[in-house]
């Protein structure tokens, strides 16, 4: 693998990671693919400090992160442990709400207008944030 020592053009460096903030919307899976095509992943929030950094950059806009429960339990896209990790859900969330009328529940997590998290229908075209780590030899994840 190759080591990334500085952030790509138009990405923001913070605490040895690079972040890219979209200005348009995609469904969660398409946002995930966008990040993967850039050798990155949807943002994985591991601390209150990182939460505040991302929140500052996205503003009060619904924005996808790399957290989903499409296969059952909640999982971060990079394998970070969900149960023991940082969480910032809104009260009463996640609720896997079925009342939206779009079919199914809510399996993908996003930042809401106040930065706290909500689960929502994965097909909604929200903005997203990609993240890639510096000084880490790039892994070769499974083929998509």
């Amino acid at each position: 693998g190759s080591e990334r020592t500085c952030c790509p053009v138009n990405w923001v460096e913070h605490e040895r990671s690079c972040y890219w903030f979209s200005r348009s919307g995609k469904a969660w899976a398409d946002a995930d693919n966008y990040c993967r095509l850039e050798d990155a992943h949807l943002v994985v929030v591991t601390s209150w400090e990182e939460q505040k950094f991302v929140q500052h950059h996205i503003g009060p806009v619904n924005t996808w992160m790399g957290l989903h429960d499409q296969n059952g339990p909640w999982k971060w896209v990079d394998g970070t442990d969900y149960e023991t990790g940082f969480k910032n859900w809104r009260p009463e969330q996640p609720d896997d709400w079925y009342g939206h009328g779009l079919g199914g529940g809510e399996d993908c997590a996003h930042f809401t207008d106040d930065g706290r998290w909500n689960d929502d229908v994965c097909q909604r075209p929200y903005r997203w944030v990609c993240e890639t780590e510096l000084d880490k030899a790039s892994q070769e994840p499974p083929l998509l």
Epitope: N10, R23, S24, D30, R36, E38, D39, L143
Partner: antibody, heavy 120, light 107 residues
Framework: EVQLLESGGGLIQPGGSLRLSCAAS????????MSWVRQAPGKGLEWVSA????????FYADSVKGRFTISRDNSKNTLYLQMNTLRADDTAVYYC?????????????WGQGTLVTVSS | DIQMTQSPSSLSASVGDRVTITCRAS??????LNWYQQKPGKAPNLLIF???SLQSGVPSRFSGSGSGTDFTLTISSLQPEDFAIYFC?????????FGPGTKVDIK
């Protein structure tokens, strides 16, 4: 000057295999996602496959999934397309192309193409 | 998969004409629509990306607009070198599908 040069095309029998290469120069190859796009004779463009800069993430059209494999060797600035179990409808000119920065697969530089003909 | 259609499939125009080509997507999206020009025996050439961003080196007579499912490529004053086939492409969702093309020829 950005240059992309495909090679490896030719006449192949149905069921056969072929490996296409695309030699890149004039840009930092490892920093860019790359794609293969094909065009059957007298027809439109069909996106075939894409690969991230490191080679760690790959994407395929349904029509080639399981038969074609995209890869790259960043030390050689070369993109590859391994094509197995070829069929008559794979006959096309195959182009390699480079992705524009900060866009999802808009392709700003293309090679001249290499013709693959699948026929018995 | 997102299907892309183009209209018209072909058109005849004269030098100096204003030409408009429409691309329609089978599902709504924003931002991720690109336009290419292809001349016989040549590789495609990127004209417009992200709906309306003009690719470097492309003449300003080319412009793009649209959102949702309907997008437009406009050539404000057709020049002799503009007679070609034009393709739209969505890069919103894999597979990154192309439209069938619009052939612009001389009236």
């Amino acid at each position: 000057e950005v240059q992309l040069l495909e090679s490896g095309g030719g006449l192949i029998q149905p069921g056969g295999s072929l490996r296409l290469s695309c030699a890149a120069s004039g840009f930092t190859f490892r920093s860019y996602a790359m794609s293969w796009v094909r065009q059957a004779p007298g027809k439109g463009l069909e996106w075939v496959s894409a690969i991230s800069g490191s080679g760690g993430n790959t994407f395929y059209a349904d029509s080639v999934k399981g038969r074609f494999t995209i890869s790259r060797d960043n030390s050689k600035n070369t993109l590859y397309l391994q094509m197995n179990t070829l069929r008559a409808d794979d006959t096309a000119v195959y182009y390699c192309a480079k992705k524009v920065v900060d866009t999802a697969m808009a392709l700003d530089y293309w090679g001249q193409g290499t013709l693959v003909t699948v026929s018995s | 998969d997102i299907q892309m259609t183009q209209s018209p499939s072909s058109l005849s125009a004269s030098v100096g004409d204003r030409v408009t080509i429409t691309c329609r997507a089978s599902q709504s999206f924003s931002h991720y629509l690109n336009w290419y020009q292809q001349k016989p025996g040549k590789a495609p050439n990127l004209l417009i990306f992200a709906v309306s961003s003009l690719q470097s080196g492309v003449p300003s007579r080319f412009s793009g607009s649209g959102s949702g499912t309907d997008f437009t490529l406009t050539i404000s004053s057709l020049q002799p070198e503009d007679f070609a086939i034009y393709f739209c492409q969505q890069s919103y969702s894999t597979p990154f599908t192309f439209g069938p093309g619009t052939k612009v020829d001389i009236k």
